[in-house]
């Protein structure tokens, strides 16, 4: 059925009208407007931008636009006491200091309030000691160091290259290894694409460029001082010692010019293999400490940042639904940036702005969506997804009863090669159908659909003729909606052809060089990729809000559940003897998946045949679809991660950016061979299989005929 049947609207107000109203030139103008000065969370500049967006969304025609403020823990460098790292000689004299700021890009030399590179939420401290190079500081890197190379990081300052995993996981791993400080740096192997010039002549990272970012391990908690509850006027705040997820050791980021000076002196053990070598002309020795001539020299960190409770502002816009105003489809993306935010987040915010404008235009012509659409400009995403999480905590009772879907809208581009989509399996068919109707912006695919270019450039590893759609992880504002509340979620952006570098981001990520010019000159001069992303995000919102029957296909969940069950079973089968010894069986899980598959199939048949003119039955069927994602939520949450409650998906415990399937079982099995009490460890595996099997079975039953 076409979307126009949703409400009594003239046929011209369909998806096509909405999509045709989206203009690349407007996105370009909005991006320029949003990127001329920094919009750091908690600053006056970002408050002013919130008010500007509120005003413009009202002008565009939304029914209401409100600011929602919270007082959350943020982190800033000390303006008079800058952070840096030095090499000190045996007398304690500083013989080398890292730079205090990034050289500003051309045209921005006189901009004030550019926050220098820092690791947000680092504690203060001035540790000094020998350096140990820990590669990417992943779990497996520390296993290699400690178990294979017998290198002890206790009492050492570790230096790790950015990339592969979320920086907070790196810091957590370093803490667990006993390090007393962490230096993060961008190696050209990960942030300098061969054959491309560095900014301002190209999109590569210059040697003085540095990636900012928070180093929290919040596990979905939101504001560290008010986990589970909104940071409102009457909030009870924890003491800083009880705050959630704060690092305990000083951390600081540097660029590769400074890293060269630290790494070139490294002595000790040689790198274990070539995967530990980057692209600098240094030996990549692991250490500990410097080589012969420099063995008396040490590294000293000088970190003086402060944590401060600061007010943040979300902008929440409402376009009331004509038929089901109590069903919410949410489009949200953040507004705060580290500096100019040329890509992150403003390439996304500009797209949201244009989507709001298009919806507003239709509304002014008398149209309304079937369901309510909420638009959000989140604050303090860069400080731990704080704005979105606090708002969801404040509105959790409404959201869990009324939330249909959440579409995320951070950076629209991280490259210009092909589409990248991460979403719940419920949205697979929606994404496939939508992209078949959209034109590809890619060179060589003129006149072809987006689906075709996407499938060709990023094929599914399992299903031929279909594009890759990835699992949702975290590191963005969908987290609370999907992982905590169980609201069907998705995200889409244009990406690079860089499969091996999946979680490293684009070279200028979170640096001062992420400017409007970066996008306009090098990534998307015609803004055609931005327009395509606007069409995908906006088109998904349109369909979710306007189709009579929700565009969710529960059969796709059945397919992936079988795939995930097979995967976790094969991981467990690496320990056949223990499985036998401790009577570990996956039968209950496979049985639950089989039941889910059968029930989902029958539900889909009923969905084709029921009387859509009966509003009660329609609402009942739609509610079963809406609440299916919710059914995968375990109110008790995952072990030690109470705000990650989705049993099928969670952010990986080793990389917040990546999604893990059946995370409870996966974590119970991880490194199980090293556990001191195998009986207890395998008992936990059995418990997690039980929880997963029960949850899948319970979810299946929500799709059964109601009586």
């Amino acid at each position: 059925k076409s979307s126009n049947e949703a409400t009594n609207i003239t046929p011209k107000h369909n998806m096509k009208a909405f999509l045709d109203e989206l203009k690349a030139e407007n996105i370009k103008k909005f991006l320029y407007n949003f990127t001329q000065i920094p919009h750091l969370a908690g600053t006056e500049q970002n408050f002013q931008l919130a008010k500007q967006i509120q005003s413009q969304w009202k002008e565009f025609g939304l029914d209401s636009v409100e600011l929602a403020h919270y007082d959350v823990l943020l982190s800033y460098p000390n303006k008079t006491h800058p952070n840096y790292i030095s090499i000190i000689n045996e007398d304690g004299n500083e013989i080398f200091n890292t730079s205090l700021f990034e050289p500003p890009p051309p045209g921005y030399e006189n901009v004030s309030d550019i926050v220098p590179p820092f690791s947000a939420f680092s504690p203060q401290g001035m540790p000094e000691g020998d350096l140990v190079y820990v590669n990417y500081a992943r779990t497996e890197d520390f296993f290699k160091l400690e178990r294979d190379m017998k290198i002890n990081c206790s009492g050492k300052i570790v230096i790790a290259r950015y990339g592969k995993v979320f920086r907070g996981n790196k810091v957590k791993n370093a803490q667990l290894a006993g390090a007393k400080g962490v230096i993060l740096y961008s190696d050209p192997a990960d942030y300098f694409a061969p054959g491309v010039k560095s900014y301002p002549d190209g999109w590569n990272l210059p040697g003085g460029g540095v990636q900012r970012g928070n180093i929290l391990n919040l596990n979905g908690a939101g504001d560290p001082l008010t986990p589970g509850y909104p940071a409102n006027e009457y909030a009870y705040r924890r003491g800083i010692a009880e705050a959630v997820g704060l690092p305990s050791i000083p951390v600081h980021p540097i660029g590769y010019y400074d890293a060269q000076k630290l790494l070139e002196k490294m002595g000790g053990s040689a790198p274990p293999d070539s995967s530990w070598r980057g692209s600098l002309k240094v030996p990549y020795n692991v250490g500990p400490g410097f080589t012969g001539n420099f063995s008396t020299q040490k590294v000293k960190m000088h970190i003086h940042s402060t944590n401060e409770v600061t007010r943040i502002y979300n902008v929440i816009g409402t376009l009331r639904g004509a038929v089901e105003p109590d069903r919410y489809v949410i489009l949200g993306g953040h507004r705060d940036s580290w500096v100019f935010g040329g890509i992150d987040p403003q390439s996304g915010a500009a797209v949201v702005h244009e989507i709001v404008r298009s919806f507003g235009t239709l509304k002014k012509e008398g149209w309304r969506p079937r369901r309510t659409i909420l638009f959000a400009s989140w604050d303090a995403e860069e400080f731990g997804l704080l704005g979105s999480t606090e708002w969801a905590e404040e509105n959790s009772r409404l959201l869990q009863e009324r939330g249909v879907a959440y579409i995320n809208a951070d950076s629209s581009i991280e490259g210009n090669y092909t589409l990248r989509v991460d979403c719940t399996p419920l949205m697979y068919s929606l994404v496939h159908n939508l992209t078949k109707e959209l034109k590809s912006p890619d060179e060589g695919f003129e006149g072809k659909s987006l689906y075709e270019s996407w499938t060709k450039k990023s094929p599914s590893p399992e299903f031929s003729g279909m594009p890759r759609i990835s699992k949702l992880g975290s590191g963005n504002d969908f987290e609370v909606f999907f992982q905590r509340l169980g609201i069907a979620s998705g995200r889409a952006r244009y990406t690079k052809n860089w499969e091996t570098n999946k979680f490293s981001g684009y070279p200028l990520y979170h640096s001062v060089y992420e400017t409007y010019e970066l996008v306009e000159k090098f990534y998307d001069p015609m803004f055609k990729y931005h327009l395509t992303v606007a069409q995908v995000r906006g088109g998904m919102v349109f369909e979710l809000a306007n189709s009579i029957v929700l565009p969710f296909d529960c059969r796709d969940y059945a397919v992936v559940l079988r795939k995930y069950a097979d995967k976790i079973y094969s991981i467990s089968m690496k320990h056949p003897q223990e499985m036998k010894t401790y009577s570990v069986s996956f039968d209950s899980l496979f049985s639950a998946v089989k039941n889910f598959t059968e029930i989902a199939s029958k539900f889909s048949e009923r969905l084709q045949d029921f009387d859509k003119s009966n509003p009660i039955v329609l609402r009942m069927m739609n509610d079963q679809l809406m609440f299916l994602e919710r059914a995968f939520i375990d109110p008790l949450g995952l072990p030690d991660r109470p705000f990650y409650r989705h049993v099928i998906y969670a952010p990986s415990s080793h990389n917040k950016y990546a999604g893990e399937s059946f995370p409870g079982i996966y974590d119970a099995l991880f490194d199980i061979e090293s556990k001191v009490d195998p009986s207890k460890a395998w008992g936990e595996v059995k418990r997690q299989i039980y929880v997963a099997a029960f949850t899948v079975q319970a979810a299946a039953e929500t799709l059964s005929e109601v009586a």
Epitope: I87, G207, S279
Partner: antibody, heavy 120, light 112 residues
Framework: QVQLVQSGAEVKKPGASVKLSCKAS????????INWVRQTPEQGLEWMGG????????NYNENFKGRVTMTRDTSSSTAYMELSRLRSDDTAVYYC?????????????WGQGTTVTVSS | DVVMTQSPLSLPVTLGEPASISCRSS???????????LHWYQQKPGQSPRLLIY???NRFSGVPDRFSGSGSGTDFTLKISRVEAEDVGVYFC?????????FGQGTKLEIK
Amino acid sequence: QVQLVQSGAEVKKPGASVKLSCKASGYTFTYFDINWVRQTPEQGLEWMGGISPGDGNTNYNENFKGRVTMTRDTSSSTAYMELSRLRSDDTAVYYCARDGNFPYYAMVNWGQGTTVTVSS
Amino acid sequence: DVVMTQSPLSLPVTLGEPASISCRSSQSLVYSNGNTYLHWYQQKPGQSPRLLIYKVSNRFSGVPDRFSGSGSGTDFTLKISRVEAEDVGVYFCSQSTHVPYTFGQGTKLEIK
């Protein structure tokens, strides 16, 4: 733009010392090593060594060890090279050259050269 | 020290014709990170040397695309696809993989 401006020509007697300067501009001085290279018709181009302006660390060619000293003054973005116990075969054009760091690790900018004549 | 040997030492070329210079090192120039730090410099009469090609095959900014570099391990080549009058000068290969850095003797390119 990047410039390396070297001091003027020198005439020295055997056994004396000469100290040459190289003033850098147009880039962040402390980020990039300064190399010293000399050129003679007989030996061609010879790398004498380099200095890291950030920490003052030096790396000398063994052929010149004990005779060459490289220093820098970060406040004036100037590198210096002193060669002692001069001999007649030290007569050459002496160049300072900026190391390009990643991705080059090559001498990306050169000074105009200083002619040193050693003659009794 | 790594010895860099260039050939020929003198190269007379007709304008518009190609030219090729060979450079051989006494040991491999592959660094532990997998990169090869072999570079080519051009020195025009009365001028300082200037970087032409870095890391075997990468043209430095502003260098015309008629210049190209190739090779691996110990054998390297600089090619000029069509020689122009302004290309007259001496061409040096150089390595910065091993300390001390060393240069070839130079190849003098002249117009026939």
